[in-house]
């Protein structure tokens, strides 16, 4: 069966939107009005992995682009990147682990934990216009809580 996917946007708990920053990075900033069109639309695919009531494995692709968020070691540190894939083969139900995030719902907020690197989360900073990154702390200065907005296909 084909993998189930939905289109959505994400905002952090400060209401910052996610936009492209160069070809292989995302950044977070406050958008309003027409600028909202800049925000990236994700194709969130529901993939194979360890699942529970509040934890669902997903892959986060950029809609109509052959780019997926992935988690890799760079200089011995878990790092978030946008990775190009062959569109003929993706998305798929059994995604490589670096593409998989555990979507965790807590109090109507979402966290995205790397399946490859447990306790590392998609994170943004309090500051405006700074990169989205993989952070190893929760509940500190860095923001790990998001809300999801559904986008019609």
């Amino acid at each position: 069966a084909p993998v189930r996917s939905l289109n959505c946007t994400l905002r952090d708990s400060q209401q910052k939107s996610l936009v492209m920053s160069g070809p292989y990075e995302l950044k977070a900033l406050h958008l309003q009005g027409q600028d909202m069109e800049q925000q990236v639309v994700f194709s969130m695919s529901f993939v194979q992995g360890e699942e529970s009531n509040d934890k669902i494995p997903v892959a986060l692709g950029l809609k109509e682009k052959n780019l997926y968020l992935s988690c890799v070691l760079k200089d011995d540190k878990p790092t978030l990147q946008l990775e190009s894939v062959d569109p003929k083969n993706y998305p798929k139900k059994k995604m490589e682990k670096r593409f998989v995030f555990n979507k965790i719902e807590i109090n109507n907020k979402l966290e995205f934990e790397s399946a490859q690197f447990p306790n590392w989360y998609i994170s943004t900073s309090q500051a405006e216009n700074m990169p989205v990154f993989l952070g190893g702390t929760k509940g500190g200065q860095d923001i790990t809580d998001f809300t999801m907005q559904f986008v019609s296909s």
């Epitope: 900033l29 994170s123 309090q126 200065q141 860095d142």
Partner: antibody, heavy 118, light 107 residues
Framework: EVQLLESGGGLVQPGGSLRLSCAAS????????MFWVRQAPGKGLEWVSV????????RYADSVKGRFTISRDNSKNTLYLQMNSLRAEDTAVYYC???????????WGQGTLVTVSS | DIQMTQSPSSVSASVGDRLTIICRAS??????LAWYQQTPGNAPKLLIH???SLQSGVPSRFSGSGSGTDFTLTINSLQPEDFATYYC?????????FGGGTKVEIK
């Protein structure tokens, strides 16, 4: 008053290492992104590296990637730049700067000179 | 990487002149542009951020305009302390990049 004071520069041989420090005062250091920017003698400005307030996010210019490491100690209000495998082309005045709204440098230190020469 | 090109690279002007410096980005940087002033032997000083916003404490004779790829710094009525080198810098994406600088000299 915001103050940034760099130290640790000097003369070093090619292949050698140096660690620069930047002591911050007059603002809540732990809340700000910080940059290192350098300027070779008689040349323009070159961005080197950035670190987030928590230290969780860092980025580097391609010219220093794999050789330089940015870090910070918020308990000491100090920013660092560990510079390894130094080359002649790393010779420059190194400035630390506080990051303002959206990615500008709103306050700068006075700079510290690094000279890489045999 | 985004390339930033400044023009002119140097200019001679007199006290009281109106001066315009141009900065062009190799791709759209929205309004994520800053302007700095640097005098010999000193660190750069932020003049303008977000393309048009005057940094606190900077005289109102300095102004910035533009968005997308084309930006200008205007100095109305040059003062003796304005003879310096000016740099633009994009903050749209990392690596951050500066223009090559514009040296403003006394005619």
């Amino acid at each position: 008053e915001v103050q940034l004071l760099e130290s640790g520069g000097g003369l070093v041989q090619p292949g050698g290492s140096l660690r620069l420090s930047c002591a911050a005062s007059g603002f809540t250091f732990s809340k700000y992104f910080m940059f290192w920017v350098r300027q070779a003698p008689g040349k323009g400005l070159e961005w080197v590296s950035v670190i987030s307030p928590s230290g969780g996010m860092t980025r580097y210019a391609d010219s220093v990637k794999g050789r330089f490491t940015i870090s910070r100690d918020n308990s000491k209000n100090t920013l660092y730049l560990q510079m390894n495998s130094l080359r002649a082309e790393d010779t420059a005045v190194y400035y630390c700067a506080r990051v303002g709204y959206g990615g500008n440098s709103d306050y700068w230190g006075q700079g510290t000179l690094v000279t890489v020469s045999s | 990487d985004i390339q930033m090109t400044q023009s002119p690279s140097s200019v001679s002007a007199s006290v009281g002149d109106r001066l315009t410096i141009i900065c062009r980005a190799s791709q759209d940087i929205n309004r994520w542009l800053a302007w700095y002033q640097q005098t010999p032997g000193n660190a750069p000083k932020l003049l303008i951020h977000s393309a048009t916003s005057l940094q606190s404490g900077v005289p109102s004779r300095f102004s910035g305009s533009g968005s997308g790829t084309d930006f200008t710094l205007t100095i109305n009525s040059l003062q003796p302390e304005d003879f310096a080198t000016y740099y633009c810098q994009q903050a749209e994406s990392f690596p951050l990049t500066f223009g090559g600088g514009t040296k403003v000299e006394i005619k």
